[in-house]
Amino acid sequence: SPSPVTPSPTLKELIEELVNITQNQASLCNGSMVWSVNLTAGMYCAALESLINVSDCSAIQRTQRMLKALCSQKPAAGQISSERSRDTKIEVIQLVKNLLTYVRGVYRHGNFRGLNDIFEAQKIEWHEHHHHHHHH
């Protein structure tokens, strides 16, 4: 019989881990560069595919394991790897921040349509952040 499979982390757990590793960080993994990916085409596999070659970076190992577990879900979960863009490289921390913004949108609203949603969410978060500091 197949080996037992560890249960997949929840979106909330992934968000908590992404917040944890990006908080107060200007860089991750010594500024390693990775391919920018289209998160709308199956965010877990797409993000994992970009991060596969980042080894020996303990800061993101837990994130990689979580993405692997989420990407391993059966097709009903819709984890479809995207057509790979090979024109833009970004820092690991930027990819992780993009993923965090995207996952937060999925967590809050149930779905996310694309880059416009990411930019809108970033604007909202910027506004929330500054509004928060203005009142406190």
Epitope: V5, G42, L48, I52, N53, S55, I80, S81
Partner: antibody, heavy 117, light 108 residues
Framework: ELTLQESGPGLVKPSQTLSLTCVVS?????????WNWIRQRPGRGLEWMGY?????NYNPAFQGRISITADTAKNHFSLQLTSMTTEDTAVYYC????????????WGHGTSLFVSS | SYVLTQSPSVSGSLGQTVTISCSGT??????ANWYQQLPGKAPKLLVH???GRLSGVPDRFSGSESGNSAALTITGLQAEDEADYYC??????????FGSGTQLTILG
């Protein structure tokens, strides 16, 4: 039980374009799965060429001369490889992966392809 | 270019245990899948990257990982196990990558 069956010309001339089709039975060609082409040159190992999953992903070794398409109505997917040379003589396999990470769980028997003038 | 390294050949007697290894930097992140290719046949997936055996695969076959290496262990070798074995993992640039294959020979 899902079965995959490759069909092709068996022989092509150098510089010609190869067209192979993989007919799927017992299941549907949909973008929920990864529909792959893999080849094996004589006495060599396995070489992944690319997959279709609604979008496509190709091995850079074939970039610029490979195209994988699917006809979901006819329940098959196809490989086109241009500018054939004798180095492309191989057995060509189609295979399905049900998740990106978990490997290719269903394979066709393979079709032998010779490139010769 | 990214390489998955396998030893070219391994041998064992009937009933023995053999281990086939595969190393590559991305194995530590995503693991490896293992395939068996009997002479003249299509490859067959045995063990996937979470260590789970495919339906119908005997429990004599098992997969494991340690760091950037994966291993396929076959216990109680049988004559029908004589085949080529391939590991397969992933690379950001290259996509799916296969190891060069290990030929298992059954002695005696």
């Amino acid at each position: 039980e899902l079965t995959l069956q490759e069909s092709g010309p068996g022989l092509v001339k150098p510089s010609q374009t190869l067209s192979l089709t993989c007919v799927v039975s017992g299941g549907s060609v949909t973008s929920n799965y990864y529909w792959n082409w893999i080849r094996q040159r004589p006495g060599r190992g396995l070489e992944w060429m690319g997959y279709w999953t609604g979008s496509t992903n190709y091995n850079p070794a074939f970039q610029g001369r490979i195209s994988i398409t699917a006809d979901t109505a006819k329940n098959h997917f196809s490989l086109q490889l241009t500018s054939m040379t004798t180095e492309d003589t191989a057995v060509y396999y189609c295979a399905r992966a049900s998740t990106w990470l978990h490997g290719m769980d269903f394979w066709g028997h393979g079709t032998s392809l010779f490139v010769s003038s | 270019s990214y390489v998955l390294t396998q030893s070219p050949s391994v041998s064992g007697s009937l009933g023995q245990t053999v281990t086939i290894s595969c190393s590559g930097t991305t194995i530590g992140v995503v693991g490896a899948n293992w395939y068996q290719q009997l002479p003249g046949k299509a490859p067959k997936l045995l063990v996937h990257s979470d260590g789970g055996r495919l339906s119908g695969v005997p429990d004599r076959f098992s997969g494991s990982e340690s760091g950037n290496s994966a291993a396929l262990t076959i216990t109680g070798l049988q004559a029908e196990d004589e085949a080529d074995y391939y590991c397969q993992s992933f690379d950001t640039t290259l996509g799916y990558v296969f190891g060069s294959g290990t030929q298992l020979t059954i002695l005696g």
